[in-house]
């Protein structure tokens, strides 16, 4: 149960939720292990191996889907898949990596002006012109897409990072995503483990910003491996 | 709209357990989280706990030690929220609230618990 | 837990004055502070989100200000119907935690 988490004296000493990032640009955002949140999705990152099993495409992160691994394989055994690129088949719009959708088949570029993400329903509380989504949990599967243009703001809530405007990332916080900030030079960020460890978290964090990396902090190196200190970086 | 209909009050014992109930409509009620939170009389607000009604995960404030439990049936679209082990401090108002965000955006009418002897 | 510290716990202002409450977080909470109004025998509502964002529906005269630890709540020009009590609530850090709540009364 999510009981853990408060039990967790990890919760209590992460870094500020915006202070953070990923250590690999391709991702929208990066977990912070072994913390869980309402929901208990896990997010899975370039750095993990081992395959996530999922019934739906929420229970995956932002840059993948949900579905059998082999064509035509039992409907029963599901994993998180890597997202579709650019002209590349699709049955569905969570197939298609952010910033694009499936129209005939095939994932196509996002006109940000004609299609924006998908939205099951318009939010009653609707945050001024954010027409974002409902806590994370939207079955993307199901999702009709409603056309609009204002892109969600920092604290707007969120399905994946194209919902959000430059400069900020989708990422996980409590029982939410919301926009956040992208890393600034010398924040706190989240280095992943490569041995597919795959942490349950309740905070994510952005990555860092256009020419840094997350790199291990060089008055840390002495530290233990556990307790080193990783923060964006000059290339 | 968006609706939040809670049990009514209810007098308890000490030593007793309460269940209250939330019932949701007006929205899908297993794409949002439910909160607990409760107003002991002229005092202010305390968090008790989530549920995600999609998997019935739940996360507790570590104050109330295991003595309370959420629990919702999909089915009715109704969130739960059982309090044991009653003491006169847990005379309160008790409140379902469901977020969209970091957030409670939509609150029940509240549910007046006393706890006497 | 994060303490979060209101100030003034009452205060008493006249229609059309500036109203101003703070509230204090015993650690940094970077922008995670929500702002709700409830008035007697009522549940609390939504004011204000992520420390400066308006809820729908609320009017242009509340707004939120601040960072980090210390955070401001206004009331552009007080109104007969904002006379409730004020609480700020931090959601940094399980579990969310308020603060103890500012009662607002009309001079």
């Known amino acids: 149960t999510l009981n853990s988490v408060l039990n967790s004296n990890a919760i209590k000493n992460l870094p500020p939720p915006l202070g953070g990032a990923a250590g690999h640009p391709g991702s929208a955002v990066s977990a912070a292990p072994g913390i869980l949140y309402p929901g208990g999705n896990k997010y899975q990152t370039i750095d993990n191996y081992q395959p996530y099993p999922c019934a739906e495409d929420e229970e995956c992160g932002t840059d993948e889907y949900c579905a059998s691994p082999t064509r035509g394989g039992d409907a029963g055994v599901q994993i998180c898949l890597a997202c579709r690129k650019r002209r590349k088949r699709c049955m569905r719009h969570a197939m298609c990596c952010p910033g694009n959708y499936c129209k005939n088949g095939i994932c196509v570029s996002s006109d940000q002006n004609h299609f924006r993400g998908e939205i099951e329903e318009t939010i009653t509380e609707s945050f001024g012109n954010d027409h974002s989504t409902l806590d994370g949990y939207s079955r993307r599967t199901t999702l009709s897409s409603k056309m609009y243009h204002t892109k969600g703001q920092e604290g707007s809530v969120c399905l994946r990072s194209s919902d959000c405007a430059s400069g900020l990332c989708c990422a996980r916080h409590f029982w939410s995503k919301i926009c956040k900030p992208v890393l600034k030079e010398g924040q706190v960020c989240t280095k992943h483990r490569r041995k597919g460890s795959h942490g349950l978290e309740i905070f994510q964090r952005c990555y860092c910003g256009e020419g840094l990396s997350c790199r291990i902090q060089k008055d840390h190196h002495q530290a233990s491996n556990s307790s080193r200190l990783h923060t964006c970086q000059r290339h | 709209q968006v609706q939040l209909v809670q049990s009514g009050a209810e007098v308890k014992k000490p030593g007793a357990s309460v269940k209250v109930s939330c019932k949701a409509s007006g929205y899908t009620f297993t794409e949002y989280t439910m909160h607990w939170v409760r107003q002991a009389p002229g005092q202010g607000l305390e968090w008790m706990g989530v549920i995600d009604p999609s998997n019935g995960d739940t996360s507790y404030n570590q104050k109330f030690k295991g003595r309370v439990t959420l629990t919702v049936d999909k089915s009715t679209s109704t969130a739960y929220m059982e309090l044991r082990s009653l003491r006169s401090d847990d005379t309160a108002v008790y409140y379902c609230?469901?977020?969209?965000?970091?957030?409670?955006?939509?609150w029940g009418q509240g549910t007046l618990v006393t706890v006497s002897s | 837990d994060i303490q979060m510290t209101q100030s003034p716990s009452s205060l008493s202002a006249s229609v059309g004055d500036r109203v101003t409450i703070t509230c204090r977080a015993s650690?940094?909470?970077?922008?995670?502070l929500n702002w709700y109004q409830q008035k007697p025998g009522k549940a609390p509502k939504l004011l204000i989100y992520?420390?400066?964002r308006l809820h729908s529906g609320v009017p242009s005269r509340f707004s939120g200000s601040g960072s980090g630890t210390d955070f401001t709540f206004t009331i552009s020009s007080l109104q007969p119907e904002d006379i409730a009590t004020y609480y700020c609530q931090q959601v940094h850090t399980l579990p969310p935690t308020f603060g103890q709540g500012t009662k607002l009364e009309i001079k």
């Open positions: 650690q940094d909470i970077s922008n995670y």
């Open positions: 609230a469901r977020t969209t965000g970091p957030w409670f955006a939509s």
């Open positions: 992520y420390k400066s």
